[in-house]
Interface confidence: low
């Protein structure tokens, strides 16, 4: 229903706390360089204005769209051009072009320092002094580094953060209480960020139809007892929610997500038997819980898929007269039977089916032509299954750090032109798939591995799109989203690459490495490994292992030495010489 004042409507629906949080996230995601204080001031002004509209919907400017109101606020920021360059040109445009322009200037890799967690004592002090400001800082810092973070989920993570601080700041040993819990939230939030970015990429590059197909497959796996109409309704609503969040319409997105959660909880009987626990929770926890609810038990009496989609005489008629609905039902039926497949694989199978019908329905004897289509799925299914087996075996043998290194070598050989920091970040993230997925039961491994890898590779593509340097990466990133992971997996050593010349300074280290946290030490070593591969792309695994073992031994020795500086300055050059010899 139409509302006189959109801002009053959203304020009333969401309540002040969530309204303010979402406006803060929106501003932080659009203008990523502004300080918390600058954004907090704007948020307060917008909130005060919203309250005047709640009191009187006919008050001046209350009828304006949220894009107009928020855009006008952002464009009124002093020194916009000095701080943001051409983004300031957006302010010369009218809505909706202005908002589209802001969206296009979102930076997936902003040059901001890493978000450092303060000491436990300091954190607890500032949290106790002003919990609202403390949580505001958290929202701001995460949102500006992750400009497509799913806003209602970020509110959920802030709530988790709040609960952890409330609990741990009352403990004697705050540090040991906070660290593992906050690490857990951070890890989940980072995964949530790359997953959501993938959804926005799907939406931006291939439109709502592609996202809706993703949603149909995912929802059909989770709710195999829901009928097609129900799944379609949920997919349509979920698509709307994601479109709004990806488009920067965060108030609408959060409001519609709450509506969708309410609908699901009111219609459990026709959706799933597994929703009750989620539905008993408060709003943010409820929506989060529903988004990762376990799969319902599959109906026992599902007929063979061939009955509807291969043996039926009306296959071509259905395809010709109701293509999207027919392909949608195929995707639904196949997905509900295969919770053990990744969504990417299910979409590849649907694409294969569509291509087969496109070809066969134009032939003289269509059934003879498409009769073997399900058998033709086999290689498409085997490929990711083999990928999971091979990689999980390797992970179990090497552990997370060793597995990351194996991936780093592999990906540096595939795309040596890509910057070392990007390769290291990608390999570390790809390597975490082992810890995340390889310990799961067999039937959960494939969906976990492939859908996670796809999300990480999407980030690789986004970073590469800014400065394209590798034809291999361009090729894989230009195709459809579901083909990316197989495309990257199939890449081999880039034969066109001219190896980097050996620079001793790249492999020169100083005693300051000894005091770095373990993660930073690993990154330094992995940076060196990538540089080695760029120098010798065809080095054998054995050669690289020899060099890295020598390197690890060198660090261990010098970091234990009484005079670390002398050790590094004398043993370092020897290490470099040995490295060169080992790779010669």
């Amino acid at each position: 229903e139409a509302h006189k004042s959109e801002i009053a409507h959203r304020y009333n629906d969401l309540g002040e706390q969530h309204f303010k949080g979402l406006v803060l996230i929106a501003f932080s995601q659009y203008l990523q360089k502004c300080s918390y204080d600058e954004h907090a001031k704007l948020v307060q002004e917008v909130t005060d204005f919203a309250k005047t509209c709640v009191a009187d919907e006919s008050a001046a400017n209350c009828d304006k769209s949220l894009h107009t109101l928020f855009g006008d606020k952002l464009c009124a920021i002093p020194n916009l051009r000095e701080n943001y360059g051409e983004l300031a040109d957006c302010c010369t445009k009218q809505e909706p072009e202005r908002n589209e322009c802001f969206l296009q200037h979102k930076d997936d890799n902003p040059s901001l320092p890493p978000f450092e967690r303060p000491e436990a004592e300091a954190m607890c002090t500032s949290f106790k002094e002003n919990p609202t400001t403390f949580m505001g800082h958290y929202l701001h810092e995460v949102a500006r580094r992750h400009p497509y973070f799913y806003a209602p989920e970020l509110l959920y993570y802030a709530e988790q953060y709040n609960e952890i601080l409330t609990q741990c700041c009352a403990e004697a040993d705050k540090e040991s209480c906070l660290t593992p819990k906050l690490d857990g939230v951070k890890e989940k939030a980072l995964v949530s960020s790359v997953r959501q970015r993938m959804k926005c990429s799907s939406m931006q590059k291939f439109g709502e139809r592609a996202f809706k197909a993703w949603a149909v497959a995912r929802l059909s796996q989770t709710f195999p007892n829901a009928d097609f109409a129900e799944i379609t309704k949920l997919a349509t609503d979920l698509t709307k929610v994601n479109k709004e969040c990806c488009h920067g319409d965060l108030l609408e997105c959060a409001d519609d997500r709450a509506e969708l959660a309410k609908y699901m909880c009111e219609n459990q009987a026709t959706i799933s038997s597994k929703l009750q626990t989620c539905c008993d929770k408060p709003l943010l926890k409820k929506a989060h819980c529903l988004s990762e609810v376990e799969h319902d038990t599959m109906p026992a009496d599902l007929p063979a898929i061939a009955a509807d989609f291969v043996e039926d005489q009306e296959v071509c008629k259905n395809y010709a007269e109701a293509k999207d609905v027919f392909l949608g039902t195929f995707l639904y039926e196949y997905s509900r039977r295969h919770p053990d497949y990744s969504v990417s694989l299910l979409l590849r199978l649907a694409k294969k089916y569509e291509a087969t019908l496109e070809k066969c329905c134009a032939e003289a004897n269509p059934p003879a032509c498409y009769g073997t289509v399900l058998a033709e799925f086999q290689p498409l299914v085997e490929e990711p299954k083999n990928l999971v087996k091979t990689n999980c075996d390797l992970y179990e043998k090497l552990g997370e750090y060793g597995f990351q290194n194996a991936i780093l070598v592999r990906y540096t050989q595939k795309a040596p032109q890509v910057s070392t920091p990007t390769l290291v970040e990608a390999a570390r993230n790809l390597g975490r798939v082992g810890t995340k997925c390889c310990t799961l039961p067999e039937d959960q491994r494939l969906p976990c591995v492939e859908d996670y890898l796809s999300a990480i590779l999407n980030r690789v593509c986004l970073l590469h799109e800014k400065t394209p340097v590798s034809e291999h990466v361009t090729k894989c990133c230009s195709g459809s989203l579901v083909e990316r992971r197989p495309c990257f997996s199939a890449l081999t050593v880039d034969e066109t690459y001219v190896p980097k010349e050996f620079k001793a300074e790249t492999f020169t280290f100083h005693s300051d490495i000894c005091t770095l946290p373990e993660k930073e030490k690993q990154i330094k070593k992995q940076t060196a490994l990538a540089e080695l591969v760029k120098h010798k792309p065809k080095a054998t695994a054995e050669q690289l292992k020899t060099v890295m073992d020598d390197f690890a031994q060198f660090l261990d020795t010098c970091c234990k030495a009484a005079d670390k500086d002398t050790c590094f300055s004398t043993e370092g050059p020897n290490l470099v010489t040995r490295c060169k010899d080992a790779l010669a």
């Epitope: 909706p96 590059k205 439109g207 139809r209």
Partner: nanobody, 126 residues
Framework: EVQLLESGGGLVQPGGSLRLSCAAS????????VAWFRQAPGKEREFVAG????????YYADSVKGRFTISRDNSKNTLYLQMNSLRPEDTAVYYC???????????????????WGQGTLVTVSS
Amino acid sequence: EVQLLESGGGLVQPGGSLRLSCAASGRYIDETAVAWFRQAPGKEREFVAGIGGGVDITYYADSVKGRFTISRDNSKNTLYLQMNSLRPEDTAVYYCAARPGQPLITSKVADLYPYWGQGTLVTVSS
């Protein structure tokens, strides 16, 4: 699969006008952003203009801003490039290109466009 077919090129005097058309076919073409690129002899392909698919947004290279206008008629699946105040340096083969299903022009790098027309030659000379 997307198919693109340009027409409307020819010889025109400096200061003159031309309207190029790009007939686009393929599934969901109206939801796909389409771009015009050009390639002068001995030079690389360069982005000229683009228009969103299902999104009211247009893009122009600085060199053509204010002189060229891009539009589309989804009912005819046709993209247009109206070129006014033509200059000799506008001489090139003009191509339309598409990245299927992408509603916005998010990159102006020619390599990222998998679908191209065969091109139409525009010569600006007195």
